[in-house]
């Protein structure tokens, strides 16, 4: 079931999925000046069975000005550095991608991919948060969020993370005011 909701935004933090649950969709988006090839896939879809999961379909972009289709090429390392995504860039690996059954790894880049990847997560997906460079983490609990479904509505749990500037004097974690759970919906309720 799709999460009709976005992971919570934490000031000065970014999130990343270490692996993607089966059913996750990734939009085939192209950078400015390029478009999906005609009859090309709209999405990549994480599919599989109990032993192996992989991304169905391939995203392909072609120049908006020409009719030529582009091939699937992995960008050179210097090109990859330019790719800005909604995910964290640092090598934070709390979970080994390969060790999670029913999950797909991060799909490789495709040529002329858009700068931001748009994922459609499913219920049960977990994302991990990390403070951006120049900020440090004050933890009150796990810096992760899970998409849950309650009464047919989906919500993400609130990650217990506060990112503070290196130079700022901050309260102890225990003195922080508790943040409201996302969407103002109850945190603990997961079944009806």
């Amino acid at each position: 079931e799709l999460c009709d909701d976005d992971p919570p935004e934490i000031p000065h933090a970014t999130f990343k999925a270490m692996a993607y649950k089966e059913g996750t969709m990734l939009n085939c988006e192209c950078k400015r000046g390029f478009r999906r090839i005609k009859s090309g896939s709209l999405y990549m879809l994480c599919t599989g069975n109990s032993s192996h999961s992989s991304w169905d379909n391939q995203c392909q972009c072609t120049s908006s000005a020409t009719r030529n289709t582009t091939k699937q090429v992995t960008p050179q390392p210097e090109e990859q550095k330019e790719r800005k995504t909604t995910e964290m860039q640092s090598p934070m690996q709390p979970v080994d991608q390969a060790s999670l059954p029913g999950h797909c790894r991060e799909p490789p880049p495709w040529e002329n991919e858009a700068t931001e990847r748009i994922y459609h997560f499913v219920v049960g997906q977990m994302v991990y948060y990390q403070c951006v460079q120049g900020y440090r983490a004050l933890h009150r609990g796990p810096a992760e969020s899970v998409c849950k479904m309650t009464h047919g509505k989906t919500r993400w749990t609130q990650p217990q993370l506060i990112c503070t500037g290196e130079m700022e004097t901050s309260q102890f974690p225990g003195e922080e005011k508790p943040q409201a759970s996302p969407e103002g919906r109850p945190e603990s309720e997961t079944s009806c």
């Epitope: 009709d4 709209l42 479904m149």
Partner: antibody, heavy 116, light 106 residues
Amino acid sequence: QVQLVQSGAEVKKPGSSVKVSCKASGYTFTSYRMHWVRQAPGQGLEWIGYIRPKRGYTQYNQKFKDKATITADESTNTAYMELSSLRSEDTAVYYCARGGGVFDYWGQGTLVTVSS
Amino acid sequence: DIQMTQSPSTLSASVGDRVTITCSASSSISYMHWYQQKPGKAPKLLIYTTSNLASGVPARFSGSGSGTEFTLTISSLQPDDFATYYCHQRSTYPLTFGQGTKVEVK
């Protein structure tokens, strides 16, 4: 209580455009996606797409990608859907529905009639 | 796209009848949701996540199924139940609905 109130019925000429509004109240507008659904006369329901009011990000059913443009105005808690290059087959009732999972609240519907 | 096929398209029944509507998905989905619609009105959520009754929905309605085959049952049809019923999947984009089953008076 949650309410979605849509704009009134419209009669339009082929080739013109129409903008349907959906004013939300009774909940935090930016906390839920707003979806749009179409129902042609005597037909079933078709999902058009949604908007995330907070970021303005939209996702469309490919069938409606060149037909519908969904926008939102946080200041008035209103979602909009503009339909362009209208044709007789665009005659339908258009509904907004609150997302966040199943569609638990719907607008009353806006009938758009395209006729020369 | 996941196609949703409801059967029957029209169902003639009498008050007190047990009514069953089936919905078949072209691919396996995690849950099915059901809506009820009356003429000139917006659809109303009836059953969510296959078998859970929405708020205020009478217990004569029930839902079941898994994978590609799902069922909506009305154990004893009441006058207020004559309407059109739609199944709906939100397991993958685009979200899709069945073509509808109209329950009419026999």
